[in-house]
Structure formats: C-alpha cells, structure tokens
Interface confidence: low
C-alpha cells in the first residue's frame, strides 16, 4: 500500500485546515493508528493527535479543542484530521505516521500554508491645490501573507509607486498615487484595490479627491449698456466665479462707498431705481481659503433725455 497526502495545504487565517492522510492499501489491510505531529526543521516533533482504530481520537493538550476528525461517513483507511481555526503560528511542516496491518508503518509530510488576508488602510496626502506640481494624493497600505497586491482604480491621470516591507511571517505593501492637481479632478473617486488569495474578492477603499482652486472672476449684467438708464428698476450686477472650497463674495465701489439703497446679496449687487449717483466703478472681490480674485466694471447710468437730444441732433445733422 501507499500513503496519499498533499504536498501543501492552503488555508485562510481563521478557517479550518484539513490535513489529508489516506492509506491506499491492498485488500485485507487495516490501519491500526495514525499519529499526527508537527515537525518543523530544527525543532523536535510536537504531537498533535493520535487516531486509534479502536479507541478513537486522542488530542494532545497543546491542541485540545482544535483537532477533530472530519465529519462522517469516515473511511477506516482515512487518517485525515481537521485543524480548527488556523492561525499564522500553525504554518509549517506536519507529518502523519500510519501503522498498518500487516504491511507495517508509513509516513508522509505536508506543509500547511496559512494565508493572512490584508486589512488595507488608505491615507489621503496633503491638501491638493491647483497649480501644485506632482503631489501625493493618497497612499494605501496592506499587510498580509503572502504579500498582497495593491493597485489603483481611477479615471484620474497619475503615477503610482510601490514599496514592500517583509516581516517574519508577512509582508506589508504600500502604494502611493501621485498626480498634478487640477480642478477637473474635484469629486473624482480614487480607489485603492487590494488583491490577495485569502480574499474571496478584491477589497476596495475609495477616497474622493478635493482640489482647492479659485476661478477668475467676471461680472455679468452690463451686457446691454442702454438698459442702464435713469429710472430703471431691478438693475443688478452678478459676480461669476467658482472654487473649492466654495468662495465668498464682497462688493465695493472704487470711487467711494456703495450708494445708499444698493443691496449686497452674496454674489449679486441689487440697485434701486437708477440715478446718475449709481455711476461709478464697482469691484467684486471673490475669495476662499486658497486664493482671491477681483473683477471691476464701470457703470455709466444714461440720461434718456440727453440721449434722445443727441439722436435728434444727429438726425438733423443728416
């Protein structure tokens, strides 16, 4: 007869490991007992359990409650055992020794490999600001056994660099994602993807990018100067800009204080019925924590009577 086992048994941390040991004997042969021991190089054998054909399973004190027989039905020639709740310290060499009648004793070794799934963490880099050069957006670290794979999933253009640190029983992998910040990246997801044979599916951690910027300011409302005439109601100027964080707006008049009756409502400057007093240079000041911008416009309130008089003159001149 001969012993059948596996060269390597692979199990995920916390799962149960089946250590196979099957005696394929000739007809009439019987298995008397199967002894399991841990036999790491440089250390003496440590008994796990003894499986006796008559008296059943005996587990050594060091493995009490952790070694069991596989569930029935059981073949009397099967000396396999279950090692419950595998931990990293269980990784190593194991030997099964089978005593048979009448053929004698056989032994076989296997290696137990315990996969330690990673628990990845994502750390955002320093605050991103438009105008910076290549900047760290985020770093992602995962430690496991064997070494995990750390990659990035994103629509954002950038570069990655990885480094790994080997520990006694595991390896830590850190991947960094660098980019040149631009406002188009705002709100875009940057996802760290960690792969490992101990994971049923990839682990993903998503970081939403925030890039500080402030767009140039401009003022709307003066597109048709002819509308800015004495007596007009509802005239307003609107300051246009955008930024991250959202900017605040402030209105001033360059050539003096804001006329009475002029209302400031955030980005909008509202005028009462227009008079020539409202003519002047108005400045919209836009700012956020990142930067500030100014835009100024000249308001020239027209007197319709003057205008029509000029038109008559022009007509008569023709």
């Amino acid at each position: 007869g001969e012993l059948e086992t596996s060269d390597v048994v692979t199990v995920v941390l916390g799962q149960d490991a089946k250590l196979p040991c099957f005696y394929r004997g000739d007809s009439g042969e019987q298995v008397g007992q199967v002894a399991w021991a841990r036999v790491d190089a440089g250390e003496g054998a440590q008994e796990l359990a003894l499986l006796h054909s008559k008296y059943g399973l005996h587990v050594s004190p060091a493995y009490e409650g952790r070694v069991e027989q596989p569930p029935p039905p059981r073949n009397p020639l099967d000396g396999s055992v279950l090692l419950r709740n595998a931990v990293q310290a269980d990784e190593g060499e194991y030997e099964c020794r089978v005593s048979t009648f009448p053929a004698g004793s056989f032994q076989a070794r296997l290696r137990l490999r315990v996969l330690v799934p990673p628990l990845p963490s994502l750390n955002p880099g320093p605050a991103l600001e438009e105008g910076q050069g290549l900047t760290l957006a985020a770093s992602c670290t995962a430690e496991g056994s064997p070494a995990p794979s750390v990659t990035w999933d994103t629509e954002v253009k950038g570069t990655t660099s990885s480094r790994s640190f080997k520990h006694s029983r595991s390896a830590a992998v850190t991947s960094e994602f660098h980019l040149v910040p631009s406002r188009s990246m705002n709100g875009q997801p940057l996802t760290c993807v960690v792969s490992h044979p101990g994971l049923l599916q990839d682990q993903r951690i998503t970081h939403i990018l925030h890039v500080s910027f402030l767009a140039e300011a401009s003022v709307r409302g003066l597109e048709d100067q002819n509308l800015w005439h004495i007596g007009r109601e509802g005239a307003m100027l609107k300051c246009l800009s955008e930024g991250q964080p959202p900017p605040s707006y402030n209105w001033t008049r360059l050539d003096g204080p804001l006329p009475s009756g002029v209302r400031v409502d955030g980005d909008t400057l509202g005028f009462p019925p227009l008079t020539t007093e409202h003519s002047g240079i108005y400045v919209c000041h836009v700012s956020n924590e990142f930067s500030s911008r100014d835009s100024q416009v000249t308001v020239d309130v027209l007197d319709p009577q003057e205008d029509s008089g000029k038109q008559v003159d022009l007509v008569s001149a023709s």
């Epitope: 059948e4 086992t5 596996s6 060269d7 390597v8 048994v9 692979t10 089946k18 196979p20 099957f22 394929r24 296997l110 064997p146 070494a147 794979s149 990659t151 792969s195 490992h196 044979p197």
Partner: antibody, heavy 122, light 106 residues
Framework: TVTLDESGGGLQTPGGGLSLVCKGS????????MAWVRQAPGKGLEFVAG????????GYGAAVKGRATISRDNGQSTVRLQLNDLRAEDTGTYYC???????????????WGHGTEVIVSS | ALTQPSSVSTNLGETVEITCSGS????YGWYQQKSPGSAPVTVI????KRPSDIPSRFSGSASGSTATLTITGVRAEDEAVYLC????????????FGAGTTLTVL
Amino acid sequence: TVTLDESGGGLQTPGGGLSLVCKGSGFTFSSNGMAWVRQAPGKGLEFVAGVNAAGSWTGYGAAVKGRATISRDNGQSTVRLQLNDLRAEDTGTYYCAKTADDWYGADDIDAWGHGTEVIVSS
Amino acid sequence: ALTQPSSVSTNLGETVEITCSGSSGYGYGWYQQKSPGSAPVTVIYSNDKRPSDIPSRFSGSASGSTATLTITGVRAEDEAVYLCGGYDSSASYVGIFGAGTTLTVL
C-alpha cells in the same frame, strides 16, 4: 495510473458558450487542485482557470476573467469549465491538469490530459 | 511573467541547462512538449520533484527568482519545447507560464 479525460470541445459559434468536462481517475481526486490550460495554434501555454481541492477557491486568467467559471464535483471526480461570450481568440487545445497539492498553481502540475480542441468560428 | 530563452542547442550526451526567471512566489514546474498540439508532459514540478516515469537525467532547482532545468546526458528524444510554469502571487494569483524554450540536439 493517473488519467484525465477531457470532453466537450468542438466547433463553437462566436458569442455562444461552451462547457468542458474533465474526469479524473487513479488518484484521490478531492486532495488535489485542478486547472484548465489552453494552447492557441502556434502559441505557448496559457492558464485559463484553476480550482483548489475543496472547490472553495478559484482563479482565472486575464483573458477569460468575467467569462469563465470553473467548478468541481469531488463525488464524481470531475472538473468543469464554463466559458461564455466566446471569441475567435478562444480557439485552441484545452488541457485539463492535476496539481500535486491542494492549490492550482502552474508550479506543481504533475499530470495532464490529452486535450480537447475548441474552434470558435461562424 | 516568466522569462526563458527562446532556444538552446546542445550536443548529444552533453549536459544542458534551461533557465526561467520571474515572480513565482511558490516554485516552478517544467513541462515538455514534443510537438505543437501534443499534450505537455511534466518533467519537474514544485522546483525539484520528478514524476516517477521521468528519467533521472532530468533535474530541477530553484534559487531566488530563477529556476533551472538540467538535463544530464542529453538524448535525441529530449529535443522538444520546454515550458516553465509558476504561480503569480504578485497581482492576479493565477498560474503563469513562460513562452517556452526550444531545445535542439545536434
């Protein structure tokens, strides 16, 4: 002696699906990892899919990921490959392979089937 | 990916080595294919294990990220393509193969 018998190949239509089955004998089927490896005409070997001894872990080559499913029935000593959305580049000889341990790496294949030919053409 | 020379030639009776390098974290296997479309034959698995029906002139070893297949006393019937296989533990966790080395026996 270890034998691995593949079946299910033949002419397939693009966009369709195929199911290959491999039956193992001469070894304790439930103790070993199994894999499917293919070879396109004039090309080298390419790992398609693998499954561990217990059937609880699987791995797929990049070319078939999302289209392939590997499964095993230890009671029947069979391993099955289901490949959907067939393409012309799936044409080749598909080999069933047994590993010496419970995983499915191409580092420890110790037995191969004779192969079954798959042609994807309209 | 696994890298191996595209071709190696040797004289009858000599010793030849074929190398394979790459990121196989768990070991290497060597597979012989005598003609395209014919089933591969395992000559070495798990770095240095030889199936019982493979002649003892075939041996394997691995050091670091390089594996070596050694054929001592090459015979004419050893002329074939030899492919190395491994297990990719760095990214996708699947089996991987080299492109193959054509051994020519002069």
